[in-house]
């Protein structure tokens, strides 16, 4: 989507490269901070965030945080540096092209978080890794 290979001038002390060794263009992410959400009990959801932003720093990735408590459900979409914790958790899946939600332990709420490194990848949050399968038999197993 955004160019697979980019070149950077040599005057930068922070060189961020992709898997091919090419210098990485900063990421585009959905960036609505925290918004109320209707995403619940679904295999995947769209963020419904209308703000697409270039990240401030080349090393930042897209992040989505889904939280549910007794009162409401929220979805947070941001850019974040994977070297730094977010909500006290390490972004373990920052290199993933898709935002696969993983549950984290937080008292008093249900808390899922995902991170990913393709443009606007936090627009589609996936709660089941099998969600995008093209195998109808497997889908049958999932829903049973």
């Amino acid at each position: 989507t955004i160019p697979p290979h980019v070149q950077k001038s040599v005057n930068n002390d922070m060189i961020v490269t992709d898997n091919n060794g090419a210098v990485k263009f900063p990421q585009l992410c959905k960036f609505c901070d925290v918004r109320f959400s209707t995403c619940d009990n679904q295999k995947s959801c769209m963020s419904n965030c209308s703000i697409t932003s270039i990240c401030e720093k080349p090393q930042e990735v897209c992040v989505a945080v889904w939280r549910k408590n007794d009162e409401n459900i929220t979805l947070e979409t941001v850019c974040h540096d994977p070297k730094l914790p977010y909500h006290d958790f390490i972004l373990e899946d920052a290199a993933s092209p898709k935002c696969i939600m993983k549950e984290k332990k937080k008292p008093g709420e249900t808390f899922f978080m995902c991170s990913c490194s393709s443009d606007e990848c936090n627009d589609n949050i996936i709660f089941s890794e099998e969600y995008n399968t093209s195998n109808p038999d497997l889908l049958l197993v999932i829903f049973q």
Epitope: K8, S9, N12, F31, I54, E56, K57
Partner: nanobody, 111 residues
Amino acid sequence: QVQLQQSGGGLVQAGGSLRLSCAASGITFSTKPVAWYRQPPGKQREGVAHISSDGTTIYADSVKGRFTVSRDNAKNTVYLEMNSLKPEDTGVYYCTAPVGYWGQGTQVTVS
């Protein structure tokens, strides 16, 4: 209210030059990275050039050596100088800055 106002597009022959401008109001460009993207007809949006707040630049391979991104902090404006233009450079060009600010788009057509 933040606005990014673009200008400078148009129709040019192959081998020609254009300079796009992206002037900001309501935001201080000098503290922000700014990027140029383009949307070629019938294709996906692609990154063209990026300039960080410290002046560090990144270019897509397809424009390296032909395009130059620069900034004038006094005028709160970022420029994209495009030389040796090719037909494949045709598209709508957008400037963007965090968080979520985009210019209105400028049509560039290379014949």
